[in-house]
């Protein structure tokens, strides 16, 4: 009679993570008597996957009933496959022996490859805000995919970026892989509404790439421009001075009026107006009673934006241009929450 052969018909099997892998194995003869065992790997360091004689195998089931006397099908199914299950599986026939069964014949092996989807890309930006014209770095990470081949692209508002570096780890063979990419982005004043997108394409995604996004509103700081102007006389001996704070982001802003270097009033930007580009404008004003001053008055609008060092703009009020009237050196009434009289 022809000697028993162990047939593993599939050289390789490809399974998606979470699915069930079927590893096929048949024997050509019932003789010699003895059990079948399945191993992952070869040699002394192999891992025992299934033992016909004994053991507990929560994820492994046999395709046919191995207790049947004439059974020659030793195929197994492994459920809930993960990338860690990848490897070459050998179906091995043992000959009954005493005290131990003796390995008799091995199949040629079936390589199990596991396709695992990458995790959703996570994009993170710099810890501190940066101003326009500065270059900032964004990182994108995705993990747990297999096989190793993967494509990563960066976009800013739909436009593909080219200044980035990508690494896939580990370099050698592994059950699953991770990708890490760093992109450099130059900020512009119009970037409050901009988005940076990291796009990952992998064979497991069937042409529907995964995307991670970061809003530049969390990264950018647009410093304000200041303009101090003197409005036409509102009433006799009164001048309205306004400080226009334009095109700033984020909204956090504190304004202080100084009269000849002395603090007159401090206020926090509240009712701002939003520009189309996402930046904000705000205006503060002072009502100045010029008749109370003998000398010129230096008015300074000082703005502290988003915790940054203060910027300021000054305006000189020429008192001599307004002839004094008798009895007009009393304080004028405040006519609004943003108004202040100097006296």
């Amino acid at each position: 009679e022809e000697e028993l052969q162990v047939i593993q018909p599939d050289k390789s099997v490809l399974v998606a993570a979470g699915e069930t892998a079927t590893l096929r194995c048949t024997a050509t003869s019932l003789i010699p008597v003895g059990p079948i065992q399945w191993f992952r790997g070869a040699g002394p360091g192999r891992e025992l996957i299934y033992n016909q004689k004994e053991g507990h195998f929560p994820r492994v089931t046999t395709v046919s009933d191995l207790t049947k006397r004439n059974n020659m099908d030793f195929s197994i199914r492994i459920g809930n496959i993960t990338p860690a299950d990848a490897g070459t599986y050998y179906c091995v026939k043992f000959r009954k022996g005493s005290p131990d069964d003796v390995e008799f014949k091995s199949g040629a092996g079936t390589e199990l490859s596991v396709r695992a989807k990458p995790s959703a890309p996570v994009v993170s930006g710099p810890a501190a805000r940066a101003t326009p014209q500065h270059t900032v770095s964004f990182t994108c990470e995705s993990h747990g995919f297999s096989p190793r081949d993967i494509t990563l692209k960066w976009f800013k508002n739909g436009n593909e970026l080219s200044d980035f570096q990508t690494n896939v780890d580990p370099v050698g063979e592994s059950v699953s892989y991770s990708i890490h990419s760093t992109a450099k982005v130059v900020l512009t004043r119009e970037d409050v509404h901009s988005q940076v997108i990291c796009e990952v394409a992998h064979v497991t995604l069937q042409g529907d790439p995964l995307r991670g996004t970061a809003n530049l509103s969390e990264t950018i700081r647009v410093p304000p421009t200041l303009e101090v102007t003197q409005q036409p006389v509102r009433a006799e001996n009164q001048v309205n001075v306004t400080c226009q704070v334009r095109k700033f982001y984020p909204q956090r802003l504190q304004l202080t009026w100084l009269e000849n270097g002395n603090v007159s009033r401090t206020e926090t930007a509240s009712t701002v107006t939003e520009n189309k580009d996402g930046t904000y404008n705000w205006m503060s004003w002072l009502l100045v009673n010029v008749s109370a001053h003998r000398d010129d008055v230096k008015l300074t609008c000082q703005v502290e934006h988003d915790g940054q060092p203060a910027v300021s703009k000054s305006h000189d009020l020429k008192v001599s241009a307004h002839p004094k009237e008798q009895g007009s050196n009393t304080a004028a009434e405040n006519t609004g929450s943003n108004e202040r009289n100097i006296y």
């Epitope: 992952r40 002394p44 360091g45 192999r46 891992e47 025992l48 996957i49 299934y50 033992n51 004689k53 004994e54 053991g55 507990h56 195998f57 929560p58 994820r59 492994v60 492994i78 860690a84 299950d85 131990d100």
Partner: nanobody, 124 residues
Framework: QVQLQESGGGVVQAGDSLRLSCVAS????????MGWFRQAPGKEREFVAG????????YYADSMKGRFTISRDNAKNLVYLQMNSLKPEDTAVYYC?????????????????WGQGTQVTVSS
């Protein structure tokens, strides 16, 4: 060289549960098959349970099947033995063992490394 350190032993009442842990260091944990053994006073060391390196296959001594569960966490280099419905006859020193090769309940013969053991006492 592999270092093994057991923990989780103690004194419990019959019918109670206990979970033993064993942390391994000194070698790639996922390349080791792991097992638990026990030795009661005046008796030989006996096999309790074994688990293959990926955790896919597990083996139990007949007297512990259904009551004891072996598991492992390769990310943390840990192997566990969950013991339920404990009996006074489960009183023993429990040892963790690591093997470079694994053949089911042949594990005692194949174990290359042993821990110091943790005492489990089950009172009636």
């Amino acid at each position: 060289q592999v270092q093994l350190q057991e923990s989780g032993g103690g004194v419990v009442q019959a019918g109670d549960s206990l979970r033993l842990s064993c942390v391994a260091s000194g070698r790639t944990f996922s390349s080791l098959d792991m097992g638990w053994f026990r030795q009661a006073p005046g008796k030989e060391r006996e096999f309790v349970a074994g688990i293959s390196r990926s955790g896919i296959s597990q083996y139990y001594a007949d007297s512990m099947k259904g009551r004891f569960t072996i598991s492992r966490d390769n990310a943390k280099n840990l192997v566990y033995l969950q013991m339920n419905s404990l009996k006074p006859e489960d009183t023993a020193v429990y040892y963790c063992a690591a093997a470079l090769t694994f053949r089911g309940s042949d594990l005692p013969r194949d174990s290359n490394y042993w821990g110091q053991g943790t005492q489990v006492t089950v009172s009636s």
